[in-house]
């Protein structure tokens, strides 16, 4: 399970339309459910239930986005519509270039993602937890445009990180 180096760029905007760019670095892990490769794209927050809709019309949302899914405690969703792996697959079907799961509330999901599928996804499936997950969700919850760059080696140049 290799380390995934995730660089998140947030575009803060003022009411006048001016904007400032903030970059935050965090680490996660590449799971065996997906490929260990780099990916980047605009962050799209997906609710776990939002990935349940099996409407064929919605099988392609956009291209090249990074899905962020905060998994809930298993007891809050005792009969999930899809496994965690199924949710990752559904996101990729809908155009995600990568999926990042916040597993802080559901650490069992780590084992599910690392069971090793015979047919792993061709896109990275990363999981984050703890302080890294908090950093990521703080940015996502700002509801501004944000981008994620996932790399399987540390960024070449030291980035100036802003504490969000």
């Amino acid at each position: 399970k290799e380390t995934a180096f995730v660089e998140v760029v947030l575009f803060e905007s003022s009411p006048s339309g001016d904007y400032t760019t903030y970059t935050t670095g965090l680490t996660g892990r590449f799971s065996r459910a997906g490929a260990t490769l780099s990916a980047e794209g605009e962050i799209v927050q997906m609710h776990p239930l939002g990935l349940c809709n099996n409407n064929d019309e919605e099988d392609l949302y956009e291209y090249g986005w990074v899905g962020v899914v905060k998994l809930e405690q298993p007891e809050l969703d005792p009969k999930p519509c899809l496994t965690v792996l199924g949710k990752a697959k559904r996101a990729v079907q809908r155009g995600a270039t990568a999926v990042i799961f916040d597993v802080s509330e559901n650490p069992e999901a780590i084992d599910q993602l690392n069971q090793g599928s015979e047919d792993p996804l061709k896109r990275p499936v990363v999981y984050v937890k703890g302080a890294d997950a908090i950093k990521l969700m703080n940015i996502v919850n700002k509801q501004k445009v944000a981008r994620a760059r996932i790399q399987h080696r540390p960024p070449r140049q030291p980035t100036e990180y802003f504490d969000m």
């Epitope: 605009e42 799209v44 919605e58 291209y63 700002k142 509801q143």
Partner: antibody, heavy 114, light 107 residues
Framework: EVQLVESGGGLVQPGRSLKLSCAAS????????MAWVRQAPKKGLEWVAS????????YYPDSVKGRFTISRDNAKSTLYLQMDSLRSEDTASYYC???????WGQGTLVIVSS | DIQMTQSPSSLPASLGDRVTITCRAS??????LRWFQQKPGKSPRLMIY???SLANGVPSRFSGSRSGSDYSLTINNLESEDMAIYYC?????????FGTGTKLELK
Amino acid sequence: EVQLVESGGGLVQPGRSLKLSCAASGFTFSSFTMAWVRQAPKKGLEWVASISSGGGGTYYPDSVKGRFTISRDNAKSTLYLQMDSLRSEDTASYYCATGGFAYWGQGTLVIVSS
Amino acid sequence: DIQMTQSPSSLPASLGDRVTITCRASQDIGSYLRWFQQKPGKSPRLMIYGATSLANGVPSRFSGSRSGSDYSLTINNLESEDMAIYYCLQHNEFPYTFGTGTKLELK
């Protein structure tokens, strides 16, 4: 099938206002950034505005900053562009698009002329 | 602001030709480059995203490539339906900027 249908275009005098709408269907509108792009007659494409999925982030080029306002109503799956202090150079077809520009509406023509 | 310098502005070509259109970015834009095709009276159509990936339904004769700050759209075995104006777009940072367009026309 993803559909984006713009409306609200028309002839307007310089200095006046106009509000464009874009009705979206066929995808989870509330999850995605949306944008407006315009094209003056016989000219190229120009990005006009983008708005984040929840509406908290709005972004504009200098050419429209302070005059145009992008907004959205996720409950109605509708995107808006409020255009104030219109100028003759704002004459263009205005397209609504998903934030990554994978899907576009058919466009609505805005003519600013006295 | 990031400038996208697109060339050529006009490209006469014959059916069956291999043609290449280039956009040069004034700053680093990573893979945040998309190519669009627009036919008269129609909305733009996404052809390439992420600089090199083909959008759904786009024929395989289209391809995108990158060399440093130069991004190229190549069409192999040109067909009459490919005659259109092509635009590049950088969406690495705001303000997003389009190239000026390349009109592909029959010789």
